[in-house]
């Protein structure tokens, strides 16, 4: 008789999840000399221990503590790039501007990027059929708790000028319900962070509007100012040119506004 299995509304664990996490860990530690001491088998064991045999709607930050300990990594606090709804461009940017870091440029972020995972209460099985959806099922699911935890910690670690890349093509350029809006903004430390600088990325070729005047950006400015952090905003009218100019800052076309 097949055992009854909870059906969740979200997609199941990414196929070959254990192999993917282990392979990513090995690759990351090979590329980053400062993380060569990390034992990837222990990392996988700690990752697995955070959610295996636990109800996937009852995960806590503490469940991830052993993994966080193993993934401890000192990030240059003044080189942090946050992003919201524009991950690909943010990652393209840090691939060129190698001294800046998104969360996914850290070991922990790299391990989990674009993956889904969950287990089942009282069994050692990984659930490849379905996992809880944040809205339809529960917020304290393994994936959401992981990202909320590491996002909070990443924002806490920031100092001086913190940059955030925002998607100017979206109806809400700044969304209070995004991870950036609900977690990261509120965990910047005013004692350490002087300025939050938003880069609003334009989508349209002929879009010359000043999106820094958008009502949602004004809302972000208000939230940040109330936290005693200065706010500045820049339009990135041509993201393709922006990236090109990061690669080749001496290019003559890079003196004009991008």
């Amino acid at each position: 008789v097949p055992r009854w299995r909870q059906q969740w509304s979200g997609p199941g664990t990414t196929k070959r999840f254990p192999e993917t996490v282990l392979a990513r860990c090995v690759k990351y530690t090979e590329i980053h000399p400062e993380m060569r001491h990390v034992d990837c088998q222990s990392v996988w064991d700690a990752f697995k221990g955070a959610f295996i045999s636990k109800h996937p709607c009852n995960i806590t930050e503490e469940d991830y503590q052993p993994l966080m300990k193993l993934g401890t990594q000192t990030v240059p606090c003044n080189k942090i790039l946050l992003w919201s709804r524009i991950k690909d461009l943010a990652h393209q940017f840090t691939q060129v501007q190698r001294d800046m870091f998104t969360l996914e440029d850290t070991l922990l972020g790299y391990l989990a990027d674009d993956l889904t995972w969950c287990g089942e209460f009282n069994t050692s099985k990984i659930n490849y059929q379905s996992c809880p959806d944040w809205r339809k099922d529960c917020s304290n699911n393994p994936v959401s708790v992981f990202w909320k935890t590491v996002s909070r910690r990443f924002a806490e670690a920031a100092c001086d000028v913190v940059h955030v890349m925002l998607n100017g093509s979206r109806s809400k350029i700044f969304d209070k319900n995004s991870t950036f809006g609900s977690v990261e903004v509120h965990n910047l430390q005013p004692e350490k962070v002087q300025t939050l600088e938003a880069w609003v990325i334009h989508g349209g070729r002929e879009d010359s509007r000043d999106l820094c005047q958008d009502p949602t950006i004004k809302e972000l400015e208000s939230i940040i100012s109330k936290r005693n952090i200065q706010f500045s905003c820049k339009n990135i009218y041509r993201p393709d040119k922006f990236l090109q100019c990061v690669k080749n800052p001496e290019d003559s076309s890079c003196t004009s506004e991008i």
């Epitope: 503590q65 401890t72 000192t74 990030v75 606090c77 990443f154 806490e156 670690a157």
Partner: nanobody, 116 residues
């Protein structure tokens, strides 16, 4: 730069109490998970008690019910109240501050000696 300074150690009789203090400077204490560790001669350093940035605590089985860890973020202080001390609690006690993206910091340690 980051400094953790322990104080409050000393010589005490079995059954007595001590309160260890850890003064932190150079960090925003509230974002760090704080811990007390101890190392007895010839033994590995072991976790005694820890308190997360959110205030959750955990203790080594050997000290549960006898030791209490607490923190005062406003004063940048962490405390370890040690009651019903036993000779086997004799060790150097170290304060630790940890943040996943800021790193791991240790104090110099304070000696606790429990005589029978």
């Amino acid at each position: 730069q980051v400094q953790l300074q322990e104080s409050g150690g000393g010589l005490v009789q079995a059954g007595g109490s001590l309160r260890l203090s850890c003064a932190a400077s150079g960090i925003i204490l509230r974002i760090y998970d704080m811990g007390w560790y101890r190392q007895a001669p010839g033994k590995q350093r072991e976790l005694v008690a820890a308190i997360t940035s959110g205030g959750s605590t955990n203790y080594a089985d050997s000290v549960k019910g006898r030791f209490t860890i607490s923190r005062d973020n406003a004063k940048s202080m962490v405390y370890l109240q040690m009651n019903s001390l036993k000779p086997e609690d004799t060790a150097v006690y170290y304060c630790n501050a940890w943040h996943v993206f800021r790193g791991n910091y240790w104090g110099q340690g304070t000696q606790v000696t429990v005589s029978s």
